[in-house]
Interface confidence: low
Amino acid sequence: DTEIKVNPPQDFEIVDPGYLGYLYLQWQPPLSLDHFKECTVEYELKYRNIGSETWKTIITKNLHYKDGFDLNKGIEAKIHTLLPWQCTNGSEVQSSWAETTYWISPQGIPETKVQDMDCVYYNWQYLLCSWKPGIGVLLDTNYNLFYWYEGLDHALQCVDYIKADGQNIGCRFPYLEASDYKDFYICVNGSSENKPIRSSYFTFQLQNIVKPLPPVYLTFTRESSCEIKLKWSIPLGPIPARCFDYEIEIREDDTTLVTATVENETYTLKTTNETRQLCFVVRSKVNIYCSDDGIWSEWSDKQCWEGEDLSKKTLLR
């Protein structure tokens, strides 16, 4: 019996379409597939950012694959041909690996890239990113932000920069249609007459950086002689009620009584008839059912009850 062999794929390469980290991996079928015309050849592709401990692996019959990468680092990938056992009367046959790498040649020293990049998606409506200039860069240095997400034909440059001393230190984004629940890619590059500036790449998902508005319309209702119900309303905006978690801070007679996290817009508090003053504030955050992460809102305005008997009274701010 002659040993069955198969060649690796040809022309394996990583192509950068200019989407700031979303890359194409593509290849051609191996040479000498004539013996396996009745067979569907498959490919096992492994890829990772250089420095990552684990490879991502896929098996496909296609001649291309797309995924997002961190362009601050290099990318390495390898692929081999698989002949399923049905083609070889027994065991699966694998070719040797074809390998390729890709990286963007870095310009400038690392210290010249932007520092402390921070992006917040305010109330799931307005994206704002800010940064600090690189260490030791001169005032003639300016930074430019580009962004892309699936749905855009090409990367776009920021058109509304936040400036300080003539330098761009942030970007106010326009309305971003259908941009959540997918990777959002950003590149901040720079220019200076004196020295090259290092580019920085960032990837995140917008739903994970939402900072909601604080809750509104805080009220008290006496439910019984020893219970008070605290209520509030979700803030105005596109975030549905099911997406909120809340943190409440309650003070009774100038002492912190309770800090609680709840999923609904109510909280029942045990209290005594001796209570002279009761105050509470609430803040909101997008919960795990709608995002993987989020930012707490600012605290609401404080709602207080003082002095009067709560048994017959509902307070509305």
């Epitope: 498959e42 684990t54 490879w55 991502k56 692996t57 896929i58 098996i59 496909t60 019959k61 995924d67 399923p84």
Partner: nanobody, 128 residues
């Protein structure tokens, strides 16, 4: 260690519906695939459906296309198999499986080699 717990199996009449659930725990990856397999009495393991956590791409066996639907829960680590227009030949033990090394679902025909964690199975019986 990854743990998978299936639920939702039972006895149903032909033409009826069931929803199977699979809850995964004990893993940290954002990139993985989860799938459903079944084994009818006296038969081999058959791939039914698969879904990717990253892309939500789905694949189905020809025998269940248009009748079964795979979906993810809000918490991502839960996957459902909504089965409708059930037939007696759908009777089997249904297994949930997961592979945290992969980012997209393979072809159904190659699914058997793409999963490294398995549940205990839940019995589905379609009979009048």
């Amino acid at each position: 260690e990854v743990q998978l717990v299936e639920s939702g199996g039972g006895l149903v009449q032909p033409g009826g519906s069931l929803r199977l659930s699979c809850a995964a725990s004990g893993f940290a990856s954002d990139d993985y695939i989860m799938g459903w397999f079944r084994q009818a009495p006296g038969k081999g393991l058959e791939g039914v459906s698969c879904i990717s956590s990253r892309y939500a791409n789905t694949v189905y066996a020809d025998s269940v296309k248009g009748r079964f639907r795979i979906s993810r829960g809000n918490a991502k680590n839960t996957v459902y198999l909504q089965m409708s227009a059930l037939r007696p030949e759908d009777t089997a033990v249904y297994y949930c499986a997961m592979d945290s090394r992969r980012v997209t679902c393979p072809e159904i025909s190659t699914m058997h080699r793409n999963f490294d964690s398995w549940g205990q199975g839940t019995q589905v019986t379609v009979s009048s």
